[in-house]
């Protein structure tokens, strides 16, 4: 059999080998496609099927506008002038080239050493679905699940049967100062069909910026707490990626796992002292916060003149 590829909406003519070019002809066309459940023999006199598959006077079969439902097998059996039976067999596949793919929501710049969403490549109106590929500086990008991540989605239009493809690219650039060019291409995977390419996008890769400042927040405000109360210290840093945070009390490192939050539950006088946090950024070294003082007091120097200080550290009038 012969493989035929036809563009959706375009006419297709299949010739019936051996058939005399003019009547009288002894021939039979039958098809097994998305429009049939089994083999359908077409009437030589024509009929309701003529809108999708019509036998021409020369014995060929005309499909005036091929559609997805016309994919399948077409067979002709003809008797030639010498009385010999000749068979033709065609396997028909259809295709539709989508619009030019586009990169939507592109990044404005990338940051080294952290995951960055480059953008989403979108292709609309293909058949069969086809594939989207990303390219970096003209070379095919192979997703490795670590430095290069691709999230794909394929949707099919309920009426037209055509596909929309989306591909989201996330990368972790290794170093700053570079200007990589990203592009995306759509391929139907058909012979002699060149891929469709998006316009390339060139992005600047910057080094992760130094922390713009390091703040130590304390709760309760002022750092004065009643015995048995809870103190929460939060090290706030605006840096990417988030650095490792260690804690210092009275000049000595605390033996705790790195964390931006230090929780002191059920405080006693032994928890009193001066606290600070140290943020260690991979490319900028350590940076220490201004210190805060924690005091544990029964009534609280700044508490109300009469009454008591509850566990929350808020004064309650008697």
């Amino acid at each position: 059999g012969q493989n035929i590829t036809a563009r959706i909406g375009e006419p297709l003519v299949l010739s019936c080998k051996g058939a005399p070019k003019k009547p009288p002809q002894q021939l039979e066309w039958k098809l097994n496609t998305g429009r049939t459940e089994a083999w359908k023999v077409l009437s030589p006199q024509g009929g309701p099927w003529d809108s999708v598959a019509r036998i021409l006077p020369n014995g060929s079969l005309l499909l005036p506008a091929t559609g997805i439902v016309d994919e399948g097998t077409f067979r002709c059996r003809a008797t030639n002038r010498r009385g010999k039976e000749v068979k033709s067999n065609y396997r028909v596949r259809v295709y539709q080239i989508p619009g030019k793919p586009e990169i939507v929501d592109p990044a404005s710049e990338l940051t080294a050493s952290v995951p960055n969403k480059v953008g989403t490549c979108v292709s609309e109106g293909s058949y069969p679905a086809g594939t989207l590929s990303w390219h970096l500086d003209g070379k095919l990008l192979i997703p490795d699940g670590k430095e290069t991540l691709v999230k794909e989605e394929t949707r099919r239009h309920p009426e037209t049967g055509l596909f929309t493809l989306r591909s989201e690219l996330t990368v972790i650039p290794t170093q700053g100062g570079t200007h990589p060019t990203f592009s995306c291409s759509f391929s139907l995977g058909l012979p002699r069909r060149r891929p469709l390419n998006t316009a390339p996008i060139q992005l600047r890769v910057r080094e992760p910026g130094p922390p713009e400042g390091i703040q130590l927040l304390v709760e309760p405000e002022g750092g004065i707490v009643a015995p048995g109360g809870t103190v929460t210290l939060t090290c706030a840093i605006s840096a990417q990626p988030p650095p490792q945070v260690h804690w210092i009390k009275d000049g000595a490192p605390l033996p705790l796992a790195p964390s931006p939050v230090l929780l002191l539950p059920e405080v006693g006088h032994e928890d009193e002292g001066t606290y600070s946090c140290v943020a260690t950024h991979p490319s900028h070294g350590p940076q220490e916060s201004p210190p805060v003082s924690i005091r544990v007091t029964e009534t609280g120097d700044e508490g109300p003149a009469e009454g008591s200080v509850g566990e929350s550290g808020l004064g309650t009038l008697a």
Partner: antibody
């Protein structure tokens, strides 16, 4: 809204001729096959003629072949049925319907026009 | 030519009844069958297309099914406005052939 309006029916003598028209609106006329169906008084439905969307190909049952001619004018969104050599058994309400091929079947129908063949 | 044998030719039923009408094709017509409803003095109205698909605006109590060359129109719960004549049509081959019709009357 799809609308089909037939006209041209009436009383005609056996052997006479009549031309029915169908004015179509509310859809892209030249995208569809069109069909005439008739219904004799108190009887069932009978297919009379079909035409493809371009007007190049026409189809008839043996009962009217060589007597009736279906045609269309896509510029005017109009369908026609020329009926010659009319017989008493052609007496019926004639309906214009959209479709007639396997993609549509028959989906929308006009209200019909009565043709009476009698002396 | 294909014959579409429709049965019964008439039936009496009450509001709320389940009604089944059958058309048998004399040869394979695939799923190329429509069902129509016709009321006296009116044009036919398509109910079902391609054997099993409900046409736009048709109540869901109507349904179509197919088993080989047997096609069935079912009205799950007959309503007063459903008393009419019903026809099947095959549009797989010429001549296009209608069933003889089924008149659904009030019991």
């Amino acid at each position: 809204e799809v609308q089909l309006v037939e006209s041209g029916g009436g009383l005609v003598q056996p052997g006479g001729s009549l031309r029915l028209s169908c004015a179509a609106s509310g859809f892209t006329f030249n995208n569809y096959w069109m069909t005439w169906v008739r219904q004799a008084p108190g009887k069932g439905l009978e297919w009379v003629a079909s035409i493809d969307n371009s007007g190049d190909n026409t189809y008839y049952p043996d009962s009217v072949k060589d007597r009736f001619t279906i045609s269309r004018d896509n510029a005017k969104n109009s369908l026609y049925l020329q009926m010659n050599s009319l017989r008493a058994e052609d007496t019926a309400v004639y309906y214009c319907a959209r479709g007639g091929d396997i993609t549509t079947g028959l989906d929308y129908w006009g209200q019909g026009t009565l043709v009476t063949v009698s002396s | 030519d294909i014959q579409m044998t429709q049965s019964p030719s008439s039936l009496s039923a009450s509001v709320g009844d389940r009604v089944t009408i059958t058309c048998r094709a004399s040869q394979d017509v695939g799923f190329y069958v429509n069902w129509f409803q016709q009321k006296p003095g009116k044009a036919p109205r398509r109910l079902i297309y391609r054997a099993t698909n409900l046409a736009d605006g048709v109540p869901s109590r109507f349904s179509g099914s197919r088993s080989g060359t047997d096609f069935t129109l079912t009205i799950s719960s007959l309503q007063p406005e459903d008393f009419a004549t019903y026809y099947c049509l095959e549009f797989d081959e010429h001549p296009l052939t209608f069933g003889g019709g089924t008149k659904v009357e009030i019991k």
